[in-house]
Interface confidence: low
């Protein structure tokens, strides 16, 4: 049975946020093998997945997970009650909202039940491991003839999030991005009425309520403006220009087509 687990790409740098301990042993045996690192992410403070690479074990092993909160009222050791599986082997644990205490030090312990001395403990700051859901309900409205305002919602305490807005027109090679603080709105002061704009937003649990490094997924994009660019030759010309730029980077001396030239070609 393959279970898909929602975890972001990339490793959280938790060197300052946890330590690993392995119980000592007298002889070289399986108990000296290091246990895989546990990675935890709190999804929108609704649930938390703590996962490990089960395939790193020399033989298939159903590792067990225990957890508690250090120096708090919740310091009683708890067993994982909802394991996640990969190829029918435990590869994670899911904790529900009531078991998540963001501002207490979370201690997670992985253990090999066949070798009880083989265990590893990590301490995590959960407020730095929150990943919000993607922003929703993106809306655009005109503030003036040339100014647009983008608004959005988050299914979380907006106060705790910062945001990154990206936008581009159909003529652009890349996104332009702008950081936005906890107030979920963004203004674009100068809009070209002849172009079609695409906007998207992502959010992060930072800096007010935590210092998370991971962003949410991007929102569904929202569009504004003329659709005509989709059918005109300008995009083809831009692609050609991009090829020329690439070739120039490789040492060619081709003349680049300027945007002004492209407009000229397009209108004639």
């Amino acid at each position: 049975l393959n279970t898909t687990i929602l975890t972001p790409n990339g490793n959280e740098d938790t060197t300052a946020d946890f330590f690993l301990t392995t119980m000592p042993t007298d002889s070289l045996s399986v108990s000296t093998l290091p246990l895989p690192e546990v990675q935890c992410f709190v999804f929108n403070v609704e649930y938390m997945n703590c996962t490990w690479n089960s395939s790193s074990e020399p033989q298939p092993t159903n590792l067990t997970l225990h957890y508690w909160y250090k120096n708090s009222d919740n310091d009683k050791v708890q067993k994982c009650s909802h394991y996640l599986f990969s190829e029918e082997i435990t590869s994670g644990c899911q904790l529900q909202k009531k078991e998540i205490h963001l501002y207490q030090t979370f201690v997670v312990q992985l253990q090999d039940p066949r070798e009880p001395r083989r265990q590893a403990t990590q301490m995590l700051k959960l407020q730095n491991l929150v990943i919000p859901w993607a922003p929703e309900n993106l809306t655009l409205h005109k503030l003036s003839e040339s100014q647009l305002e983008l608004n959005w919602n988050n299914r979380f305490l907006n106060h705790c999030l910062e945001h990154l807005v990206q936008y581009r027109t159909d003529w652009d090679h890349s996104w332009t991005e702008q950081s936005v603080d906890y107030r979920h709105k963004f203004s674009l002061p100068s809009v070209d009425g002849q172009k079609r704009y695409t906007f998207r937003v992502r959010s992060r649990f930072n800096p007010l309520c935590g210092s998370a490094q991971h962003w949410s997924e991007w929102s569904h994009p929202i569009h504004w403006g003329s659709n005509t660019s989709k059918e005109n030759p300008f995009l083809f010309a831009l692609e050609a220009e991009q090829k020329l730029i690439s070739e120039e980077d490789l040492g060619g001396e081709q003349k680049l087509i300027s945007e002004e030239d492209l407009h000229h070609h397009h209108h004639h």
């Epitope: 305490l157 907006n158 106060h159 603080d181 930072n206 800096p207 210092s211």
Partner: antibody
Amino acid sequence: QVQLVESGGGLVKPGGSLRLSCEASGFTFNDFYMTWIRQAPGKGLEWIAYISKSGDKMRYADSVKGRFSTSRDNAKNSLSLQMNSLRAEDTAVYYCARFYGDIWGQGTLVTVSS
Amino acid sequence: DIQLTQSPSFLSASVGDRVTITCWASQDISSFLVWYQQKPGKAPNLLIYAASALQSGVPSRFSGSGSGTEFTLTISSLQPEDFASYYCEQLNNYPWTFGQGTKVEIK
């Protein structure tokens, strides 16, 4: 231990200048927006300035705009407030605080008097 | 600028009393409001952020509610260490502004 420590307060004559410093420790300074807030003797709190994480964006209250400027050195975990053209009404305890006030410095008293 | 008006400005109460302080905003500030406690000679201490979220380490007898233009801070059972001044602050619009404060005194 997470803390902010201000320094640089003192007595200054009207029209004079003063530079306040705020040293941060115990947290990743460049992850946080920072603010300056002041409190005149026996009065309430007044927000006066804000600076973004990278230090590229600043906002000021009208009462200090054009006279005060804030900057930060993330490499040194420090924040500063340069106060010029000081007036008697600038007399107050000045606090630096982490963005929305979860961590405050102990405050430093600035007295503007001839 | 957004004006915040706190009521009352002074409040006399006894240990064990339930105390409510109100903060009115001159325009809608959504939930972008925080509450602080300040004792003489000390820096303010954050109690509540986002109108109703209890700051870590703050006793659960403190609670906040409201959104839009009317907000309240409630102390369910006043303790001796709660005699202090309380301020609301809005973070919805620049410039950020504070209420004038409420001083809670021993009756």
